[in-house]
């Protein structure tokens, strides 16, 4: 039998009936066997076909077969109901070989010219399958010349049979208190030849509960228990299953915190699998009862392991564990069914006894000693000598535990000394130097420290004085002996004060004139204000209207008197302000250098002389009555004058305090 070409020869060629294109002879049988390379098939088509037609092609025919299968038996010229001619059909081998047999019987009624056919090897597309046939590959099929290969979707691995995709479904660990797990692809059919292991692993103390939901469909067998595909559930205590078939298994209460679920499938079948919803339970903790004036959140029917609750107190109540305050409280349920900490109390906020107010007092408004939430207290300052600064003194115990003013301040109010009070009333006429009476000059301060000088009390812890009076002590403030509340210079009955710091105006130059002759002394303690110790007021912006030429000011001190000795008793003198040009002119002639009187000075005294301040009065206040406020204020500080106090045509020169208000305020606020 003639053989066609064999691979690796090129596989293509022509076949024809014997004698073609002439007629074929009777009793002919010819067989060709064509073989293509593996992964290839043979394609055959006819360019000419003319054979005797007979019923079922019994007489003359061309038979095409591939392996054991007959592909076609051909005769005639055109197909009929029972016979087939090739026409324009193309024929394909089923594998890599094709057998072609030509046979003619003993006679022909007329001459037939036979056939001519061409063949060639071509690649088989193994990925193309006929409808109804099983796909070549489970997931993806890839054709190539001479063959094909399969691959799998993510989450699968190719089985060793090179066609099936097994699910990569092991090693999943579920640690949440509830969740869902299912067979791969659920509710679509699960993969073949797979072995899946799922773990539920909860904290010790939890118990896992398994519920099969929706549908259950795992390949089964009528006689043998789950021989093909099965689901098993394993705990540290027992094994459940195997499960297969179409009935949802019952709930499984595992009484274990760890569960392993195994699902194994074989190579056949088309089943949708299973879905499990799991929950967990644990020993419940005692139901938390909120403390009075508090509430529990969140509210749950029961609280089990890891559940927690917080306590929130009503406004005006605070969380306390005994005496210790808590901003927040959260308790967590433990595995033994106990809470990890005890319930706190929601205690009414207690602001505690209010702080004492220096130079003031506090009164309980709500009730004696009541210091709890919404309680009201009233601060007030000691009458006459103190006044409350920017506050009405009413404080409420607020929810944050602090006494709070109506303006929202948590700091104490301030009792500021009332300034400028004097027992003395002034007249319009000039007196000679007179003895002061108690309460006339309660701001008067005696400064001892090498020399005798004076000053005036500001607020309750500052003294205003002249720079030249304390210049020597500027670096040794503690050397200053400061006395107040007395009229007699040598009296043992006085209020002692000590200096903490001395601030000399930066524009003052010692022994080079008296410009900027001003200083402040900070006391190391506040002094108690009373009728004999009261601060002088600083001038208001409008104060210059009370300090015009010829307006009367009062100077006081223990300085030299007309007898030439320091006064034993505090003396004072009422003197008029002198026109500035007049004063400047008075000190332009020798021995005074030009420019001795500056814009930072004011002058006071009589042209005729006799009324003046003198050595020892330095630093003392020249005061004026503000007729609008009816308070005394400091307009000048005793600074300098003629060598002979009270000399006619000469005047006392005073530091003009109104020019230094910003300087004074800055130092007092900074220190």
């Amino acid at each position: 039998t003639p053989l066609g070409p064999k691979w690796p020869e090129p596989v293509f060629g022509r076949l024809a009936s014997p004698g073609f294109p002439g007629e074929y002879a009777n009793d002919q049988e010819r067989r060709w066997t064509l073989t293509a390379p593996p992964g290839y098939r043979l394609r055959l088509y006819f360019t000419h076909f003319d054979l005797e037609l007979s019923h079922l092609c019994e007489y003359d025919f061309v038979k095409l077969s591939s392996g054991a299968k007959v592909l076609a038996t051909l005769c005639g010229q055109e197909s009929t109901d029972t016979e087939r001619a090739p026409g324009k059909d193309t024929f394909y081998s089923l594998g890599s070989s094709l057998d072609i047999t030509f046979r003619s019987d003993y006679s022909n009624e007329k001459p037939f010219t036979g056939f001519e056919a061409f063949y060639a090897a071509e690649d088989i597309d193994e990925c193309q399958v006929a409808p109804g046939e099983a796909p070549t590959c489970d997931h993806h099929c890839h054709n190539h010349l001479g063959g094909f290969y399969c691959s799998c979707r993510a989450g699968y691995v190719l089985h060793r049979n090179k066609r099936t995709c097994s699910a990569l479904c092991s090693g999943q660990v579920f640690t949440q208190r509830s969740g869902e797990l299912s067979s791969p692809e659920y509710p679509r059919p699960y993969p073949k030849l797979s072995s899946c292991t799922y773990s539920i692993s909860l904290e010790e103390g939890f118990s896992v509960i398994l519920d099969f939901v929706e549908s259950f469909d795992v390949e089964t067998h009528p006689e043998t228990l789950c021989p093909y595909d099965f689901l098993k559930i394993q705990t540290d205590r027992e094994e459940h299953g195997p499960f297969c078939g179409k009935t949802l298994p019952h709930r499984i209460e595992t009484k274990s915190n760890t569960v392993t679920i195994t699902f194994v499938t074989d190579e056949s079948g088309d089943h949708t699998g299973w879905k499990i919803h799991y929950t967990s339970t644990a020993q419940p903790c005692p139901y938390p009862m909120a403390p009075p004036n508090g509430h529990v959140s969140p509210v749950q029917a029961k609280y089990i392991l890891k559940d927690s609750f917080s306590i929130f107190c009503e406004t005006g109540y605070e969380l306390l564990q005994g005496h210790l305050p808590l901003k927040s409280f959260t308790a967590v349920c433990q595995k033994d069914g106990s809470w990890d900490r005890p319930m706190p109390a929601c205690s009414i906020v207690d602001c505690g006894p209010p702080d004492d107010l220096p130079s003031g007092r506090v009164e309980y408004i709500t009730g004696p000693g009541v210091t709890t939430y919404k309680a009201v207290i009233q601060y007030s300052c000691e009458e006459t000598f103190y006044t409350m600064k920017v506050n009405d003194g009413k404080y409420v115990c607020e929810a944050d535990g602090f006494w709070t003013s109506s303006k929202g301040e948590k700091s104490l109010p301030v009792c500021e000394p009332v300034c400028g009070l004097s027992a003395r009333t002034t007249g319009g006429r000039i007196y000679g130097g007179q003895k002061a009476k108690p309460g006339d000059f309660p701001w008067q301060v005696l400064i001892l420290g090498g020399t005798t000088a004076a000053g005036a009390l500001l607020y309750d812890n500052w003294v205003l004085t002249a720079a030249h009076a304390v210049y020597e002590q500027k670096h040794d403030a503690s050397a200053l002996d400061i006395r107040m509340g007395t009229l007699k210079r040598l009296s043992p009955h006085y209020t002692q004060a000590w200096s903490e710091a001395v601030f000399i105006h930066e524009g003052y130059t010692h022994d080079a004139g008296f410009d900027n002759d001003i200083a402040l002394i900070k006391l190391n303690n506040k002094v108690v204000i009373n009728s004999n110790i009261t601060p002088i007021c600083l001038p208001r912006k409008e104060a210059e209207s009370f300090m015009r030429t010829d307006d009367i000011g009062t100077a006081s001190g223990w300085g030299l008197t007309q007898r030439g000795f320091l006064a034993r008793n505090l003396m004072y003198v009422d003197i008029p302000i002198v026109d500035h040009q007049k004063c400047t002119a008075a000190y332009e002639k020798p021995p005074y250098p030009r420019g001795s009187v500056t814009a930072n000075m004011l002058c006071a005294g009589l042209e005729s002389g006799g009324k003046d301040s003198c050595r020892g009065d330095s630093g003392g206040a020249l005061v004026f009555l503000d007729s609008e406020t009816e308070r005394w204020f400091v307009g000048g500080i005793v600074s300098w004058g003629s060598m002979n106090c009270g000399e006619a045509g000469q005047y006392g020169v005073y530091t003009k305090v109104i020019n230094y208000i910003p300087w004074i305020e800055n130092i007092i606020s900074d220190f």
Epitope: G322, L324, P325
Partner: antibody, heavy 115, light 107 residues
Framework: EVQLQESGPGLVKPSQTLSLTCTVS?????????WNWIRQPPGKGLEWIGY???????SYNPSLKSRVTISVDTSKNQFSLKLSSVTAADTAVYYC????????WGQGTTVTVSS | DIQMTQSPSSLSASVGDRVTITCKAS??????VAWYQQKPGKSPKALIY???YRYSGVPSRFSGSGSGTDFTLTISSLQPEDVAEYYC?????????FGQGTKLEIK
């Protein structure tokens, strides 16, 4: 981790003011709890001085109240102790601590009151 | 002030022994009691709060009980590292007060 660290002079003269600071790391003082000062005289037991709470409120041992001030500097996450008019009886190891649900102590700082 | 009276003031026990330290409050302190362990030259370390709640990291051999005025610290099996001074403390009311201490030694 929460850490507390005391700092301040180890020697204070009688009648002066003892000042100590506790620096807290790993937790904000204003977040919660009471921040305490506790002391332990040599060879003796523990004595609570007082606390400042997360909100800035203070509570003092009545036996020391007239001399004690506890304050907080939230910007530095520190709280401080001032004890005025000290005497030899105030010589002790001073601890800062947060008590109850959170319990951490500083390592302690020895303060000697002596002239 | 609430007095916290500890007993005994010192005790000696063998490794493995069960040790009990008691603390009596001069008035009701509910369960607002803590227990501290202090080793020489070290800061106190809290063991128990709210009378019976063990701090995390504290060995389970330490336990506390009691409420009102009578409280107990128990070491179920004494270990060499438990040698220390032990203090009870009440935080029920101002001032917070400590017991005078119990010195625990190994025989």
């Amino acid at each position: 981790e929460v850490q507390l660290q005391e700092s301040g002079p180890g020697l204070v003269k009688p009648s002066q003011t003892l000042s100590l600071t506790c620096t807290v790391s790993g937790y904000s003082i204003t977040s919660d709890y009471a921040w305490n000062w506790i002391r332990q005289p040599p060879g003796k037991g523990l004595e609570w001085i007082g606390y400042i709470s997360y909100s800035g409120r203070t509570s003092y041992n009545p036996s020391l109240k007239s001399r004690v001030t506890i304050s907080v500097d939230t910007s530095k996450n520190q709280f401080s102790l001032k004890l005025s008019s000290v005497t030899a009886a105030d010589t002790a190891v001073y601890y800062c601590a947060v008590l109850y649900a959170l319990d951490y102590w500083g390592q302690g700082t020895t303060v000697t009151v002596s002239s | 002030d609430i007095q916290m009276t500890q007993s005994p003031s010192s005790l000696s026990a063998s490794v493995g022994d069960r040790v009990t330290i008691t603390c009596k409050a001069s008035q009701n302190v509910d369960t607002n009691v803590a227990w501290y362990q202090q080793k020489p030259g070290k800061s106190p370390k809290a063991l128990i709060y709210s009378a019976s709640y063990r701090y995390s990291g504290v060995p389970s051999r330490f336990s506390g009980s009691g409420s009102g005025t009578d409280f107990t610290l128990t070491i179920s099996s004494l270990q060499p590292e438990d040698v220390a001074e032990y203090y009870c403390q009440q935080y029920n009311s101002n001032p917070l007060t400590f017991g005078q201490g119990t010195k625990l030694e190994i025989k």
